[in-house]
Interface confidence: low
Amino acid sequence: RAPRCRELPAQKWWHTGALYRIGDLQAFQGHGAGNLAGLKGRLDYLSSLKVKGLVLGPIHKNQKDDVAQTDLLQIDPNFGSKEDFDSLLQSAKKKSIRVILDLTPNYRGENSWFSTQVDTVATKVKDALEFWLQAGVDGFQVRDIENLKDASSFLAEWQNITKGFSEDRLLIAGTNSSDLQQILSLLESNKDLLLTSSYLSDSGSTGEHTKSLVTQYLNATGNRWCSWSLSQARLLTSFLPAQLLRLYQLMLFTLPGTPVFSYGDEIGLDAAALPGQPMEAPVMLWDESSFPDIPGAVSANMTVKGQSEDPGSLLSLFRRLSDQRSKERSLLHGDFHAFSAGPGLFSYIRHWDQNERFLVVLNFGDVGLSAGLQASDLPASASLPAKADLLLSTQPGREEGSPLELERLKLEPHEGLLLRFPYAA
């Protein structure tokens, strides 16, 4: 008799793939075209990335540091009208892209939550949640919650409103904190809250340290669904050298939880390469003409257009990983087991019941390494085979689909491998 299938967990939409943050509409669209109507025209691009949700804004009226002139129910006219927003929502729904609205109140000011009048601001947020839920948004994001007094209790209240409307609605909170204890205290009082933080940003870009951070986090959060990013808002290039971007993309897409990216992460957008552009929101490089400030600063391989035409580009890797993440059961909701593979390496298995299994091996170092995969670290339910098929490498030159002997696995500097192997009873 065939073994009984394991019961599938309840899957919310944000469990099925990545979220894509567009914090600055104008920078995302460029050429002074930063409005909701223009964003609607970019939804096909978001579809091509296979992302499940768009985290938008803030786009509400906010006069810097002025509570009275901050209206969370009104869209700043620079971004468009309520009709434009409704139209964007409709188009996004047709393309199966959910829209999450950032309601961080004082986004143009010094303190995102204003320094005083906490209760007034909290009431405004509460009213805004109800208003925008009725308008059809799929969730909300609030950032810089370390600046919000009594954040846990407010988040619990806002979560109740959101979930009370529908279990299918999401609340994301963002913090600049990278301290695990602070992060856990925010999570403890808020079931189902998705929290983005700077937890992974000080991973020091070493395999051992990253492994330790990831496993500590997963052990501490238990069965909770978590999210993976390097910060609540900033680009991967703010924290990582170019040679580690592919590795981190592979990792973020294959860890158990929701990967969260900022616009431009898929092409390695780097503010430091664009003189005069703000680190937190550089202009998106659609093509070479997107940054006319200094001609020649942008080459084709830095742009969406150039990378779309190159199967070996970061963007092509992002698309492939996003596709795998959204359709493979083991990556969607599979168990996670990290195990030793040697100094400088981080490796883990993702598996679900009798479905195809995945092995991830990441070399964070700048030297080539032989992987000594210690299968003894793994439970019987997640044992390693002698060979696994190469699904993809972050580096060019390997023959995809070819079986690799796991005992003789060698990785190039900064290389990550995604291997697949079948369930064996």
Epitope: P275, G276, Q277, P278, P292, D293, I294, P295, G296
Partner: antibody
Framework: QVQLKESGPGLVQPSQTLSLTCTVS????????VIWVRQPPGKGLEWMGV???????NYNSTLKSRLSISRDTSKSQVYLKMNSLQTEDTATYYC????????????????WGQGVMVTVSS | DIVMTQTPSSQAVSAGEKVTMNCKSS????????????LAWYQQKPGQSPKLLIY???TRESGVPDRFIGSGSGTDFTLTISSVQAEDLAVYYC?????????FGPGTKLELK
Amino acid sequence: QVQLKESGPGLVQPSQTLSLTCTVSGFSLSTYGVIWVRQPPGKGLEWMGVIWANGNTNYNSTLKSRLSISRDTSKSQVYLKMNSLQTEDTATYYCARHYYDGTYYYGYFDYWGQGVMVTVSS
Amino acid sequence: DIVMTQTPSSQAVSAGEKVTMNCKSSQSLLYSENKKNYLAWYQQKPGQSPKLLIYWASTRESGVPDRFIGSGSGTDFTLTISSVQAEDLAVYYCQQYYYFPYTFGPGTKLELK
């Protein structure tokens, strides 16, 4: 009117760190970028790096590992720090204003300081 | 990096003479989007800091006498002084601002005959 003035030590020991200040007036560091250029005695000009209006920096790759440019907008001052100085770093160091037309930053320099001569010698 | 070369390295002239000096870049400085050449010329008199003369290869900075004429496109540029005055004795540098890092030519020194 627009003015830039460099200040700092005239003599630095080899292997030590050079610290220079560029004090500006007549324009805001929140609007314009400021660059540093150096000129060894009897030689040509070398662009060292820039600090942009938003505080971002770009450096000449040949100096990147040793160079740091920062600023204090409230004091209208831009700072250059360069470590591990050798005798070949002996030069006149200039700060200059990066051109800005209200929309774009273009990389030519419309106002210069008078320069400060720095000798690296024991 | 873009390499800028200048010829001649020095030139002896008499007052009233017409002078031309050349600047060549290792890559084109013409941006097809706006048809502009990203090249500037500076004048540096002895003991002084450089002074911007010309930008966009041919646009004179305000206050610069019209005897200074910039021309050229792509990789080859020329600075012409139509009638040299004594106060023009200086070193002239070209500089590209098309790519990072910005680079200067080695200079052309104008001396009195």
